[in-house]
């Protein structure tokens, strides 16, 4: 047959030759020839390549910079990149997690619907009727108003989304 114009999976075409790609974790040193195989070398410490490739340089592992609030969630290998996450109380600003910001707090009148993670911010919701939050917090949900009735008391001051009801003793009816 004549030299090929297309190659099999995990091969690439160069100089009319179908050469084997380098496996993940290795970089290309030299293309194959009529008489020799593709030559590959393992990536060095702190380097990786995560696909079958013909790259002549491995990629550097991501650096989880503590100054940006980052820490290592999963150490990189020759075939995988390092995965960063944020320190406690912080979350990533993007999917790539290149920097962190402090978790948002829910203001008074709002409660935490979903607590923040290393990759997502706090989700707040307004306290509905019958619930309140009187603090700025990244953890506190809206609390239900106190039930005066169960304490054999009456509502002296109505609750709001920021304050609890104030209960007091029932007025005695004088004869």
């Amino acid at each position: 047959p004549e030299p090929p114009t297309a190659c099999r999976e995990k091969q690439y075409l160069i100089n009319s030759q179908c050469c084997s790609l380098c496996q993940p974790g290795q970089k290309l040193v030299s293309d194959c020839t009529e008489f020799t195989e593709t030559e590959c070398l393992p990536c060095g410490e702190s380097e990786f390549l995560d696909t079958w490739n013909r790259e002549t340089h491995c990629h550097q592992h991501k650096y989880c910079d503590p100054n940006l609030g980052l820490r290592v969630q999963q150490k990189g290998t020759s075939e995988t990149d390092t995965i960063c996450t944020c320190e406690e109380g912080w979350h990533c600003t993007s999917e790539a997690c290149e920097s962190c910001v402090l978790h948002r707090s829910c203001s008074p009148g709002f409660g935490v619907k979903q607590i923040a993670t290393g990759v997502s911010d706090t989700i707040c919701e307004p306290c509905p009727v019958g619930f309140f939050s009187n603090v700025s917090s990244a953890f506190e949900k809206c609390h239900p108003w106190t039930s005066c009735e169960t304490k054999d008391l009456v509502v002296q001051q109505a609750g709001t989304n920021k304050t609890d009801v104030v209960c007091g003793p029932q007025d005695r009816l004088r004869a």
Partner: antibody, heavy 112, light 112 residues
Framework: EVQLQESGPGLVKPSETLSLTCTVS?????????WNWIRQPPGKGLEWMGY???????NYNPSLKNRITISRDTSKNQFSLKLSSVTAADTAVYYC?????WGQGTTVTVSS | DAVMTQTPLSLSVTPGQPASISCRSS???????????LNWFLQKPGQSPQLLIY???NRFSGVPDRFSGSGSGTDFTLKISRVEAEDVGVYFC?????????FGQGTKLEIK
């Protein structure tokens, strides 16, 4: 077009060292490929002697024991053969080759 | 070493007729990646060897399509579908899977 050209003395005395140089044009010997020396004694077949790779490392035919050295001069795009302690059995046409391209060959006679 | 045995050692063919040369290796020429580095060369009278076929079945650039190579493992064949006068010379197989590289002893093709 890749071209290879052998050069060196055509007559070497027994027990002396045979020295040949191959000048390559049209391709850098540091880019890729294995750069070989092959010989053909009169009326006989071809014998692979050894190669120097694009990265400068070598491989030799064990039949030549410790007599053979292949080196290179990258500034001149040349590679060289040295064969020590020669005898009449080393009389041959010597080729340098990339295997897809060959030099025209040079005849070396070992005689006193 | 991989010993390469060619048959026949000589061949006389009428122009236009086919010719076939066999090359057998004493060990498999398939490497761990599944590739086989078996090559065929023609050395015309007074010339250097020229590459015809590489990696068992791939024609080198400029080689007429009447030349074809086949085989696997230890058994390989070079076929000329219709011999022409210019095809005379000695045909060699060469394996470069294992070091040392080794040639077959050659098959001389003559025209009747």
């Amino acid at each position: 077009e890749v071209q290879l050209q052998e050069s060196g003395p055509g007559l070497v005395k027994p027990s002396e060292t045979l020295s040949l140089t191959c000048t390559v044009s049209g391709y850098s010997i540091t880019s890729n490929y294995y750069w070989n020396w092959i010989r053909q004694p009169p009326g006989k077949g071809l014998e692979w002697m050894g190669y120097i790779r694009y990265d400068g490392s070598n491989n030799y035919n064990p039949s030549l024991k410790n007599r053979i050295t292949i080196s290179r001069d990258t500034s001149k795009n040349q590679f060289s053969l040295k064969l020590s302690s020669v005898t009449a059995a080393d009389t041959a046409v010597y080729y340098c080759a990339r295997l897809d391209y060959w030099g025209q060959g040079t005849t070396v006679t070992v005689s006193s | 070493d991989a010993v390469m045995t060619q048959t026949p050692l000589s061949l006389s063919v009428t122009p236009g007729q086919p010719a076939s040369i066999s090359c057998r290796s004493s060990q498999s020429l398939e490497n761990t990646n599944g590739n086989t580095f078996l090559n065929w060369f023609l050395q015309k009278p007074g010339q250097s060897p020229q590459l015809l076929i590489y990696r068992v079945s791939n024609r080198f650039s400029g080689v007429p399509d009447r030349f074809s190579g086949s085989g696997s493992g230890t058994d390989f064949t070079l076929k000329i579908s219709r011999v022409e006068a210019e095809d005379v010379g000695v045909y060699f197989c060469l394996q470069v899977t294992h070091v040392p590289f080794t040639f077959g002893q050659g098959t001389k093709l003559e025209i009747k």
